[in-house]
């Protein structure tokens, strides 16, 4: 049990103890949510105190202060997903429609997602906000007719399901054009019932 002497400058539990070189001893670190209020000596172990409101320490530490909680910066495109606690900093993420453009241990700056052009959609990612859109083509039988960061490819209209006949097949950028079976001229509107 700390404190105890250490000649080789290493401690038995690296996570929860640290080497104090002045006394050549191993002392306890303070648990998450606390800080060192009194340093250890040969006869007394570290004394810890709870972090004050609006401050935190995330790890086992031998810091003499707690870190100040910082809000998520909306100017940098960030929003809060979990508040700061004594044991954890404020959890931030990119606002909807944005992705992380600068990373330094955590996201520091978000930017607007790129539009995907007609005929494409954003490839689905494991984690929202992780990277910019990578636009991929619509699968066969699907279309997407806008420039948008979030539009999804939709299946082509099946004219027969609406009792209509196909006037022009769909492409990646346009829906199937349907017409009434009795119509001879192709209509101007796509994927809709025209009388």
């Amino acid at each position: 049990v700390p404190p105890y002497g250490s000649e080789n400058q290493t401690c038995r539990d690296q996570e929860k103890e640290y080497y104090e070189p002045r006394h050549r001893i191993c002392c306890s670190r303070c648990p998450p949510g606390t800080y060192v209020s009194a340093k250890c000596s040969r006869s007394r172990d570290t004394v810890c105190a709870t972090c004050a409101e609006n401050s935190y320490n995330e790890h086992w530490n031998y810091l003499t202060i707690c870190q100040l909680c910082r809000p998520c910066d909306p100017v940098m495109g960030l929003e809060e997903i979990a508040p700061c606690t004594s044991k954890r900093k404020t959890q931030c993420r990119c606002q909807p429609g944005m992705f992380c453009a600068a990373w330094a241990l955590e996201c520091t700056h978000c930017e607007l997602l790129s539009d995907c052009p007609p005929g494409t959609e954003a490839e689905l990612k494991d984690e929202v906000g992780k990277g910019n859109n990578h636009c991929v083509p619509c699968k066969a039988g699907h279309f997407q007719n806008t420039s948008s960061p979030s539009a999804r490819c939709q299946p082509h209209t099946r004219c027969e399901d609406q009792g209509l006949v196909e006037a022009a097949p769909g492409t990646a950028q346009s829906d199937t054009t349907c017409r009434n079976p009795s119509e001879s001229l192709p209509p101007e509107m796509s994927g809709t019932m025209l009388m």
């Epitope: 052009p117 005929g119 990578h134 636009c135 991929v136 083509p137 066969a140 022009a168 492409t171 990646a172």
Partner: antibody, heavy 128, light 107 residues
């Protein structure tokens, strides 16, 4: 210099399987979509399959859908085409190709611009 | 699916001639049209992308034009090394289809 080198072709019986490989060099493999194109003896080019840079999105010609699987291993800079339930009509030279992305394009979409580099091809013969 | 039709299927010409090959799409494909050259026993070579943009390293005697459904590949002055098969390909809508090819041979 950008290079693509296919391997894995050969003679296989109908119903059999084969895995083609395409080793890529000279470019950032993980940044580009990749394509397989085939050419039956004395015939024209036929688009077979396409894979996105991440490998998460894949596309197939109707003639191979459900039988062929395209994949990629970024750590090995290699593109694959797993071919199952092979038929006589799958006999062809198979080319892998790198999709083109022109420098002057504003909207980053590699898929509209075809391919710019081709491998030398590997021959697959399906016959009993 | 979008069908690509090339014409002519074969063409005889002489060195120095101006040659035009056409490609027609069954639907509007904007300018998402590419041209490839292939010599017998060799892999295809990319010539033109986006209907009219030359791939790097391709001689300027090759040019492409068109938009929508009708496209052309023009070789302004045929060289001996230009005798080959030429293919167009649309990259507008999956599946990305090729034309049937045009065989350009020496007259």
């Amino acid at each position: 210099e950008v290079q693509l080198l296919e391997s894995g072709g050969g003679l296989v019986q109908p119903g059999g399987s084969l895995r083609l490989s395409c080793a890529a060099a000279g470019f950032t493999f993980s940044s580009y979509p990749m394509t397989w194109v085939r050419q039956a003896p004395g015939k024209g080019l036929e688009w077979v399959s396409l894979i996105s840079p991440s490998g998460a999105t894949t596309y197939y010609a109707d003639s191979v859908k459900g039988r062929f699987t395209i994949s990629r291993d970024t750590s090995k800079n290699t593109l694959y085409l797993q071919m199952n339930s092979l038929r006589a009509e799958d006999t062809a030279v198979y080319y892998c190709a790198k999709n083109h992305y022109p420098d002057d394009v504003i909207i980053k979409n590699y898929y509209f611009y075809g391919v710019d580099v081709w491998g030398q091809g590997t021959t697959v013969t399906v016959s009993s | 699916d979008i069908q690509m039709t090339q014409s002519p299927s074969s063409l005889s010409a002489s060195v120095g001639d101006r040659v035009t090959i056409t490609c027609r799409a069954s639907q509007d494909i904007s300018n998402y049209l590419n041209w490839y050259q292939q010599k017998p026993g060799k892999a295809p070579k990319s010539l033109i992308y986006a209907a009219s943009s030359l791939q790097s390293g391709v001689p300027s005697r090759f040019s492409g034009s068109g938009s929508g459904t009708d496209f052309t590949l023009t070789i302004s002055s045929l060289q001996p090394e230009d005798f080959a098969n030429y293919y167009c390909q649309q990259t507008h809508t999956i599946p990305y289809s090729f034309g049937q090819g045009t065989n350009l041979e020496i007259k």
